[in-house]
């Protein structure tokens, strides 16, 4: 989101001073071309201006910076590193900056950043160390608390020989240099599944966004490590059914919401256990709203209104029952 | 910093009604069940009942003693929290408690304000 | 309702010693594997504090000599070494079912 100081308070920079300029050391109340800097906000915005690269001559004083909207394709090592470093940097979003490349270090030097968002840029080669910095097993702590990565899955096309979701949590799990990580926005990725590993090691995250993905189970995931879960959202992805494993992690969070709306949920003996489970919990919100979506026979009926006898599984014939 | 502060409480008549106000700060009031709890003078704790959050519809539960009788509703614009007592009884009488539920509403409540005294008699 | 029932009424304590408090539920407070049972503090003349949640979680702030166990219906309260700061009344309270209800408390004095 945009700062709310009023647009008259930024000061915008000529384009022709640029070339001038760009060579020198930057002076300390100095905007990079094309961009707009309020001192009073420390925030600087870059906006919609076709930029290839991150501007050399940021101001020291800035903690809010707006890269949207630009064509900056390859983030490389150090892209932020400067002398001094941005050390009051703290908010950096890069959305919709068509980068596909996101090189190891990227965001090395920032000792102040919380707040990083990737979302809507193709993603095709996330370094693992994009994150952590180093190829260290055991990195120094990222200061990262929220980490936006909507919508970064580049066309089938342009895909790496890869799994992507391998990719992407590789990225997050390397060195362990997320642990202070309290949001993690991951939504419209096309996800099919997600890496069991992942969300042991993310101890701190209050905030989980799943939304919009093509998650069709969640048998080996396990979210009892995260104590500190307030939120998850696993809305418009392919869930048919929970499990009881699964139901008991999430009812024993002390803080969760869980989001599920817009679900193929299947209404067959399976759903039983699920179905008890959303009469009586609280956790799920919205929960009123859940419908069937296969069998035919049960299309949008509403979960919470389904008894036992509604729930049936077609007896598997022996094969010398069945019929050609 | 979570807080809760009642307010409203005072003397009435059997058969009158008041209405207890909460007003909550420190925290996204939309996102939390809220509810009441009483204690008569010298007695133990009674759950009166409780609203849910956003997600939930902000729908209500009661406890069967104050059913009909006792409502209970929120502004979130004002992040407030209000009971609604009519046709009170002399049993009534009691501290009533404004309590936040914490997230999983199943593990109850996590902070509580300091209490509006109501008093029914003649 | 779940009825639950608190012993001891009263509960002298000697400072350093330890001391124990019982609820029993009149049926299990288990959902899903979690027993939601809770133990509060009350001061006095101050409200109700949380101590445990889910029957052996120790909520944030709370001194850990408090310890809570048990599992369905059968839960206890622990203070491992007493202090002056603990006197009040104690109440179990469980949150399975609506209504949610409260043991009738157990009063913490000192000796």
């Known amino acids: 989101s945009s700062p709310t100081s009023s647009a008259s308070s930024f000061s915008s920079s000529a384009p022709f001073l640029a070339s001038a300029v760009s060579a020198q050391p930057p002076l300390p109340d100095q905007c990079p071309a094309l961009c707009e800097c309020s001192e009073a906000a420390r925030t600087v915005k870059c906006v919609n201006r076709n930029l290839t690269e991150v501007p050399t001559d940021l101001p020291a004083y800035v903690r809010n910076l707006f890269l949207t909207g630009n064509q900056l394709a390859v983030l490389p090592a150090g892209a932020f590193a400067r002398r001094p470093p941005l050390a009051e940097l703290a908010a950096l979003n890069l959305s919709g900056s068509r980068l596909d490349e996101v090189r190891a270090g990227a965001f090395e030097h920032l000792p102040s950043l919380r707040q990083l968002d990737l979302s809507h840029n193709p993603l095709a080669d996330l370094s693992p160390f994009a994150f952590s910095g180093s190829n260290a097993s055991v990195s120094a702590p990222s200061p990262l608390v929220e980490l936006i990565l909507n919508h970064i899955v580049p066309p089938e096309d342009e895909r790496q020989n890869r799994s992507f979701e391998g990719m992407v949590v590789a990225a997050l799990l390397a060195g362990r240099a997320l642990q202070g990580l309290r949001r993690l926005e991951l939504a419209s990725n096309h996800f099919l599944y997600l890496p069991r590993d992942v969300l042991a090691q993310l101890p701190s995250l209050r905030h989980l966004d799943l939304s919009n993905n093509s998650l069709v189970s969640l048998t080996y995931v396990s979210f009892r490590n995260l104590t500190h879960l307030e939120s998850l959202h696993l809305e418009d992805n392919a869930l048919k059914v929970l499990h009881n494993g699964t139901l008991a992690e999430l009812q024993g969070l002390p803080h969760i919401r869980v989001f599920l709306d817009n679900n193929p949920w299947v209404c067959d003996c399976h759903m039983a256990d699920m179905v008890t489970w959303l009469k009586e919990t609280e956790v799920v919100q919205g929960k009123d709203r859940l419908t069937c979506a296969y069998p035919e026979k049960m299309r949008n009926r509403v979960l919470l209104e389904l008894n036992s006898a509604d729930l049936d599984c077609d007896p598997i014939l022996p094969p010398s029952l069945q019929t050609s | 910093e979570v807080q809760l502060v009642e307010s409203g409480g005072g003397l009435v008549q059997p058969g009158g009604s008041l209405r207890l106000s909460c007003a909550a700060s420190g925290f996204t009031f939309t996102d939390y069940y809220m509810s009441w709890v009483r204690q008569a003078p010298g007695k133990g704790l009674e759950w009166v009942g409780f609203i849910r959050n956003k997600g939930n519809g902000y729908t209500t539960e009661n406890s069967a003693s104050v059913k009909g009788r006792f409502t209970i509703s929120r502004d979130n614009a004002k992040s407030s929290l209000y009971l609604q007592m009519n046709s009170l009884r002399a049993e009534d009488t009691a501290v009533y408690y404004c309590a936040r539920y914490r997230g999983n509403p199943h593990y109850a409540m996590d902070y509580w304000g300091q209490g509006t005294l109501v008093t029914v008699s003649s | 309702d779940i009825v639950l029932t608190q012993s001891p009424l009263s509960l002298p304590v000697t400072p350093g010693e330890p001391a124990s408090i019982s609820c029993r539920a009149s049926?299990?407070?288990?959902?899903?594997?979690?027993?939601?049972l809770q133990w509060y503090l009350q001061k006095p003349g101050q409200s109700p504090q949380l101590l445990i949640y889910g029957a052996s979680n120790v909520e944030s702030g709370v001194p850990d000599r408090f310890s809570g166990s048990g599992s369905g219906t059968d839960f206890t309260l622990k203070i491992s070494r007493v202090e002056a700061e603990d006197i009040g009344v104690y109440f179990c309270?469980?949150?399975?079912?609506?209504?949610?209800?409260f043991g009738g408390g157990t009063k913490v004095e000192i000796k």
């Open positions: 049926e299990s407070v288990e959902f899903y594997g979690t027993s939601f």
């Open positions: 309270q469980q949150s399975r079912k609506v209504p949610s209800t």
